[in-house]
Amino acid sequence: KSPVFGPQEVSSVEGNSVSIKCYYPPTSVNRHTRKYWCRKGASGRCITLVSSEGYVSSNYAGRANLTNFPENGTFVVNIAQLSRDDSGHYKCGLGINSRGLSFDVSLEVSQGPELPNGTEVYTVDVGRTVTIKCPFKTENAPKTKALYKKIGQTSVLVIDSRNYVNPNYKDRIRLRIPGTGQLIFTVVIDRLRLSDHGLYLCQAGDGSNRDEKNADLQVLEPEPELVYEDLRGSVTFHCALGLEVANVAKFLCRVNSRETCDVVINTLGKRDSAFEGRILLNPQDKDGSFSVVITGLRKEDEGRYLCGAHSDGQLQEGWPIQAWQLFVNEESTIPRSPTVVKGVAGGSVAVLCPYNPKESQSLKYWCLWEGAQNGRCPLLVESQGLVQEQYEGRLSLLQEPGNGTFTVILNQLTTQDAGFYWCLTNGDTRWRTTVEIKIIEGEPNLKVPGNVTAVLGETLNIPCHFPCKFSSYEKYWCKWSNTGCQTLPSQDEGPSEAFVNCDENSRLVSLTLNPVTRADEGWYWCGVKQGHFYGETAAVYVAVEEKKVAGSRYVSPAKADAAPDEKVLDSGVREIENKAIQDPRLFAEEKVVADTGDQAGGSRASVDSSSSEEQGGSSK
């Protein structure tokens, strides 16, 4: 007996859609083998109509698809715009059509229920609005207009032109009679409920001359859209509920085991703490549509999600909804990267951000998640070099190590830097990831002077002290600009034995500027790295002033000033729409800094990693 299972009988009506789910044991082989849906012919052969390898027969073009959910051992065949010709015997299966891993499915497409002649059929989703059109003759223009609902053999009055409204329809129904000359009245029912389903009768006038029109109202609960996203990745729920609710509070909720719906986020400021730092509700368009982005997907995020509109910001019967069934694929293409990065006050962090390696040319961004109201994520830095003003000199986005990962370095950390940050690109939105920066107790490992004043035309040496644990790392100095941090030409660091027996006298890398020019003013970073992977950095600002006293200047760490206080974000910073991102409404980019000028000239700057402090001063 075949291990594949599905519905033996599927019945539907013309014009409708079916979603046929076939279940299989999720062994490694089964998960990755071909899935198919075929129709059994008179000869006994089964002709493929759609398969997981992308094949769609001409008969199914534009109206059918097959989606595999390997972790759940399920694949789904969706067929839309059914006709009676689709009635027949089918198989859903794995592998080759003629082999035994399949399941027989009978599909019956009927004309629909027998309805009175001339019945108009209205098919509407729950919570939406329907407008029932009711024609009448001229002689019935001045007479009473009414809408009845047929329940069994009786007709129940729903609304009439004498201002009667059935209590079941209170505050959500209206009867409109047009001006003279138009021989049609309409009944508009808002916020449709499942109980509104049924046969209705429009009537104008009474007696034998009355006009009648039948309307069949089918109210459907939306079939959840199946969404299959990678662990650690991102999902976007696009929610379009219609103009009728454009000005009503919106929400996204997740259905729980009690079949109620827990609010995940709404426009009234509510947010589930499980989604802290990794959710945004996009500002809605004029048509009332909005979207919700969730990053850093976890297995426990799986489930049924509903978006909707209601003044309370939560699910209520009879209000429009959209539904999704989210599955999180544990066989993720998104690499593991730390979700929490820790740094100390005054220190630094280097964050690795994954991106789709097929999109190496995409623009890379880093933004700070802000939880207020619906959440927003203003850009702090992007690969084209724009850096937000208050991050000048302490933030850089590097394309390294490349091949699906970029690096963001933030230094001069303060407690205000703690929070959630998003890595993203203007390409594949599913690769948005979240990282939390935590500020912990401790001292920075790299020590540089707080700030330095250099004299024009003279020589400047800036020491950077590192602990023994970094002795095997590559040390570098670079000059920061808003387009990155240009590494300064490094001189031979001398024999490697200098660091083998690491002691107090062999932990110094010095930057020498000789002679100092105006262009040397700016931020310099001392850092350590291993190959293309960056470690800690420390920043020092070099101010350049006119010559006062002749001679060279050496800055000793003992005379170094304290690092300047972090500039705090001005809450009034203007938001600028960022055109580079696919969904520009999701993120706002703050004021950006102009380029800070030329890099220090190559031959004038040198980096010296010496075996003793005394030797650190000279430029070789």
Epitope: F5, E9, V13, N16, L220, P222, E223
Partner: nanobody, 126 residues
């Protein structure tokens, strides 16, 4: 909260027929799965049949052991589901449970149903 009440159980001769009914009260849904499971004395509960309504279409599932003999039907507007059992065999003897599940997802043979009835006893004598 949804309550499920089964009826129609009883004693029947082998080869005979029986019709079980299940009524759900407490909530209206246009999209959910209702199923029948059974548990014979000393055995584990097993799937018998299920019906799923979704988007105006109906999907019916049967266990191999009852295919061709049992027929499930229902009216989702009235939240009822019936099980017509023909050609009954002594091995069909069991307590039959009605179950409802609100999610349209998941294998209907599984136990992940949200609501269960108290059960009705069907005894098939030889």
């Amino acid at each position: 909260q949804v309550q499920l009440v089964e009826s129609g159980g009883g004693l029947v001769q082998a080869g005979g027929s029986l019709r079980l009914s299940c009524a759900a009260s407490g909530r209206a849904f246009s999209q959910y799965t209702m199923g029948w499971f059974r548990q014979a004395p000393g055995k584990e509960r097993e799937f018998v049949t299920a019906i799923r309504w979704s988007g105006g279409s109906i999907y019916k599932y049967y266990a191999d052991s009852v295919k061709g003999r049992f027929t499930i039907s229902g009216d989702n507007a009235r939240n009822t589901v019936d099980l017509q059992m023909n050609s009954l065999k002594p091995e069909d003897t069991a307590v039959y449970y009605c179950a409802a599940r609100m999610s349209p997802w998941g294998d209907p043979r599984g136990n992940e149903y949200d609501y269960w009835g108290q059960g009705t006893l069907v005894t098939v004598s030889s």
